[in-house]
């Protein structure tokens, strides 16, 4: 069943077929007997009861009132009574845009990340059974969509979707065609959950080292899910039995990004692995971010500053 | 609209340097990183290199180490693959596009080296 | 480098018949910390750029139909067009992302029987 019409405030559109609808329908089925009645007000006139001798274009069934359409006159407040029960409504009818398929104040927005799933669903379940057909338009140009009843779009968004998309539904009422149109501004945006990322720490790091010790090289940045880290060095990696890449370490942060970390253990270090670069590249769909890492003997280590140490 | 516009065609001779632009509009440009590949006439498709538009950072490809520049200008959304010491084997269709799956292409610019 | 080998390097089909191209990385392009394949297909036309299809092994593009799909994973991997149309007809090439230089397969090339 067609929910009530809770909202206080509802702005329509001239020519449309328009309902409201009291939100204690299923009370007033079972106090059958109870007298229901609904009333307009409007500038100078106080609670005029409707019903419908009031006007041709008005429809009165167990729980609404409708419009067959709603034209500019029709704006004013509207109030439901029944025994205790009040209910009001404050009506705008606004004009039709004659030089468009839709009106603009009535457009609902909604922003969708490209690649990211999108979906319009042409439906008016109220006039369902009434509906001959329906169209769907993309800036006032016909969609050629399979079904004609329920037109839908479903697919992962891509920039070029972007814009108003217009649901127009034909329906025949008392021999009379109308059309109820309901439009979307879809605005299509880059994926907002994505960051650059970040190597953490300083970008050029010497390390003090002895010749026939071990010693561990840390790279840590905050990446995205799909975001890559990993070690390069020498001419292909690898070559070197001495030098090792750990499992790379992740944890999920709370903005749902990531901080990873990966071990580069170089055993026994030769005169080999001195003054030579160590790379760790972090890559992404943005480019990459590089940090090196250059061991040094001890013994030569007054020759740099002490800035420029990692320990 | 999404897309990648790049400069005209050029004919060089052998030594020469080529310039090609390539413009982006209808995203945010520092998003991806634009990667340039080439197509000799009637082969597969070369892997040239890549800059990082958010921190200009480059990685080309080994056999074109020293002879190809990678630039972007952030202030007109545009990146820029330079090429010199231009030999007849750089004939090519020369193509910019964006992010490391390449979803998004320019038409291409047909570079002829010929004396 | 990683080395892309594409198989085979042409393909007759019939139309309406199933087209099965593969592609073979010489190192693994699976990135065991997200479990994700750095690898994508490509179709290019005569005269036109390159058109993505595929990304992550078996993500389709959008806009992409449904009769193209991806799989496989770490070095193994497979485009299948599930019935073959005619405006298919293509060089189809594969390409990994996984460490630079990004590396494309040698291209195949689909016709029809």
């Known amino acids: 069943a067609e929910s009530c019409t809770s909202r206080p405030h509802i702005t329509v559109v001239e020519g449309e077929p328009f309902y409201l609808k009291h939100c204690s329908c299923s009370l007033a089925h079972e106090i059958e007997t109870t007298t229901k009645s609904w009333y307009k007000s409007s500038g100078s006139q106080e609670h005029v009861e409707l019903n419908p001798r009031s006007s041709s274009r008005i429809a009165l069934h167990d729980c609404v009132l409708e419009f067959w359409p709603v034209e500019l006159n029709d704006t004013g407040s509207y109030f439901f009574q029944m025994k205790n029960y009040t209910q009001k409504w404050k009506l705008n009818v606004i004009r039709r845009n004659k030089h468009s398929c839709f009106t603009e104040r009535q457009v609902t927005s909604k922003i969708v990340e490209v690649k990211k799933f999108f979906q319009i669903t042409c439906e008016n379940s109220y006039y369902q059974t009434l509906v001959n057909s329906t169209s769907l338009y993309k800036n006032c140009k016909k969609l050629l969509l399979e079904n004609n009843k329920n037109p839908t779009i479903k697919k992962n968004a891509e920039f070029e979707d972007q814009g108003y998309y217009s649901c127009v539904h034909f329906l025949h009422h008392n021999g009379k065609l109308f059309n109820i149109t309901k439009t979307f501004n879809i605005t299509i945006v880059e994926d907002r959950s994505n960051i650059v990322p970040v190597l953490l720490g300083p970008k050029l790091n010497h390390v003090a080292v002895e010749l026939g010790k071990n010693v561990r090289l840390n790279c840590s940045a905050l990446l995205n899910e799909e975001d890559v880290i990993y070690w390069m060095f020498g001419e292909e990696n690898g070559s070197d039995p001495n030098i090792h890449e750990e499992k790379e370490m992740r944890i999920m942060t709370p903005e749902g990004k990531w901080h990873a970390s990966k071990v580069l253990r170089i055993e026994n270090i030769g005169e080999s692995n001195l003054n030579v670069l160590y790379n760790c590249t972090v890559a992404s769909t943005g480019g990459t971010d590089t940090k090196s890492f250059i061991l040094v003997r001890k013994a030569d280590m007054a020759d740099i500053p002490g800035h420029v140490f990692t320990r | 609209q999404v897309q990648l516009v790049q400069s005209g065609a050029e004919v060089k001779k052998p030594g020469a340097s080529v310039k090609v632009s390539c413009k982006a509009s209808?995203?945010?440009?520092?998003?991806?990183?634009i990667s340039w590949v080439r197509q000799a006439p009637g082969q597969g498709l070369e892997w040239m290199g890549w800059?990082?538009?958010?921190?200009?950072?480059?990685n080309y490809a080994q056999k074109l180490q020293g002879r190809v520049t990678m630039t972007t200008d952030t202030s007109t959304s545009t990146a820029y693959m330079e090429l010199r010491s231009l030999r007849s084997d750089d004939t090519a269709v020369y193509y910019c596009?964006?992010?490391?799956?390449?979803?998004?292409w320019g038409r291409g610019t047909l570079v002829t080296v010929s004396s | 480098d990683i080395v892309m080998t594409q198989s085979p390097d042409s393909l007759a089909v019939s139309l309406g018949e199933r087209a099965t191209i593969n592609c073979k990385s010489s190192q693994t392009v699976l990135y065991s910390s997200n479990n994700k394949n750095y690898l994508a297909w490509y179709q290019q036309k005569p005269g036109q750029p390159p058109k993505l299809l595929i990304y992550?092994?078996?993500t389709r593009e959008s806009g992409v139909p449904d009769r193209f799909s991806g799989s496989g994973s770490g070095t193994d991997f497979t485009l299948t067009i599930s019935s073959l149309q005619a405006e298919d007809v293509a060089v189809y090439y594969c390409?990994?992302?996984?460490?630079?230089?990004?590396?494309f397969g040698q291209g195949t090339k689909l016709e029809i029987k």
């Open positions: 800059i990082s538009v958010y921190n200009g950072n480059t």
């Open positions: 992550w092994s078996s």
């Open positions: 209808g995203y945010t440009f520092s998003s991806y990183g």
């Open positions: 596009t964006r992010g490391w799956y390449f979803d998004l």
């Open positions: 390409q990994q992302y996984y460490r630079t230089p990004y590396t």
